[in-house]
Interface confidence: medium
């Protein structure tokens, strides 16, 4: 009846993991396509959207024939997080306007909290060093306009959907490397 | 909305060059990897290469190594495509398209290069 | 010859379901995303479907798409006239260090 009190776990399948990993991922790249589509329904802006306090893009063509496991995770994970945060700042501070995007911003807020979960489980299982805890980030300033919060909220999920999409065909080629 | 437009292609001489250029707009151009695709007369699509969003990292099919280079300036939203020891069956539609990851996920409409004596 | 193998045409009647294949080894289809693109008449590629079964803004959920080990199919349901274009599958070849296409497959509407 099962392993006794103390006895290793097995661990499960590297492969498997980081399926379900992929799977996560394309479900919450697929998520932040469908909010993009009423993002700039409800509030069309053309051109460039920036914003500088976002992570500058960490893969492409280039860099993915040199990945390494470890270094993925790591910068995944932490530019991940760093769209959480963002992600939660602009559920603080949108104004009115931008409370028509709710609940579907919160949901996306959960589902990226649970890929960083998953991601840091896979690091683990993985036996990749864990990252000691990120220093408090400075808080990022409120939007100065309904419009600059607008601009953020596209640049925002416009970065996120770029990352997931590179991190959807990161995480397929490393699956083939292990 | 994204747009690419690409420019320059025309009739060309075997074993003259060309410059294409792709005028990108609608979307952060130097967040992107860009891509060069063909299609010559009746026939399939084949990929010809691609420059990274920095332009730091290029790849290229076998088929134009040595011949063709593509570079960008980012400071304009463009990309280009400069085609040296051209020859006939480098006749086709060149395209330029944006790549969000493995995919091509806006095309521009074509310009034509015809190598022809 | 292309690396990724389709049938160079396929046809059906409005309202029927079509499915086009798309044959690939370990190197392509078995260790990347597959991606399909249509092609209307004198126009240029669009997206039509992106790491192997996802839609793009904008493409109707007619169209959907499947991988199994190393090959891959684009089906298309509730078949319509405007629907009559050339489809491409393609994916990045790891042996290549490219992106490889399929030929392509013709399809007619019929009637």
């Known amino acids: 009846p099962g392993p006794p009190p103390g006895s290793p776990r097995a661990s499960p399948d590297p492969r498997a993991e980081l399926d379900s990993t992929v799977l996560l991922t394309r479900s919450l790249l697929e998520d932040t396509r469908q909010l993009t589509i009423q993002l700039k329904d409800k509030f069309p802006a053309d051109g460039d959207h920036n914003l500088d306090s976002l992570p500058t893009l960490a893969m492409s063509a280039g860099a993915l024939g040199a990945l390494q496991l470890p270094s993925v995770l790591t910068r995944l994970r932490a530019d991940l997080l760093s769209y959480l945060r963002h992600v939660q700042w602009l559920r603080r501070a949108m104004g009115s306007s931008l409370k028509t995007l709710e609940p579907e911003l919160g949901t996306l807020q959960t589902r990226l909290d649970r890929l960083l979960r998953r991601l840091q489980l896979l690091m683990s299982r993985l036996a990749l060093p864990q990252l000691p805890p990120d220093p408090p980030a400075p808080p990022l300033a409120p939007p100065s306009s309904t419009w600059g919060g607008i601009r953020a909220a596209h640049a925002i999920l416009g970065g996120l959907h770029l990352t997931l999409d590179w991190a959807v065909r990161g995480l397929l080629l490393l699956k083939t490397r292990l | 909305e994204v747009q690419l437009l690409e420019s320059g292609g025309g009739l060309v001489q075997p074993g003259g060059s060309l410059r294409l250029s792709c005028a990108a707009s609608?979307?952060?151009?130097?967040?992107?990897?860009m891509n060069w695709l063909r299609q010559a007369p009746g026939k399939g699509l084949e990929w010809v290469g691609v420059?990274?969003?920095?332009?730091?990292?290029?790849f290229y099919a076998d088929f134009v190594k040595g011949r063709f280079t593509i570079s960008r300036d980012n400071s304009k939203n463009t990309l280009y495509l400069q085609m040296n020891s051209l020859r006939a069956e480098d006749t086709a539609v060149y395209y330029c398209?944006?790549?969000?990851?493995?995919?091509?996920?806006?095309w521009g409409q074509g310009t034509l290069v015809t190598v022809s004596s | 010859q292309s690396v990724l193998t389709q049938p160079p045409s396929a046809s059906g009647t409005p309202g029927q379901r079509v499915t086009i294949s798309c044959s690939g080894s370990?190197?392509?289809?078995?260790?990347?995303?597959v991606n399909w693109y249509q092609q209307l008449p004198g126009t240029a590629p669009k997206l039509l479907i992106y790491y192997d079964d996802l839609l793009p803004s904008g493409v109707p959920d007619r169209f959907s798409g499947s991988k199994s080990g190393t090959s891959a199919s684009l089906a298309i349901s509730g078949l319509r006239s405007e629907d009559e274009a050339d489809y491409y599958c393609?994916?990045?070849?790891?042996?290549?260090?490219?992106?490889?296409f399929g030929g392509g497959t013709k399809l007619t509407v019929l009637g």
């Open positions: 398209a944006r790549t969000p990851g493995s995919h091509f996920d806006y």
């Open positions: 393609s994916a990045w070849d790891d042996s290549l260090n490219g992106v490889v």
């Open positions: 609608g979307f952060t151009f130097s967040h992107y990897d």
């Open positions: 420059i990274s969003y920095d332009g730091s990292n290029k």
């Open positions: 370990s190197s392509n289809i078995g260790n990347n995303a």
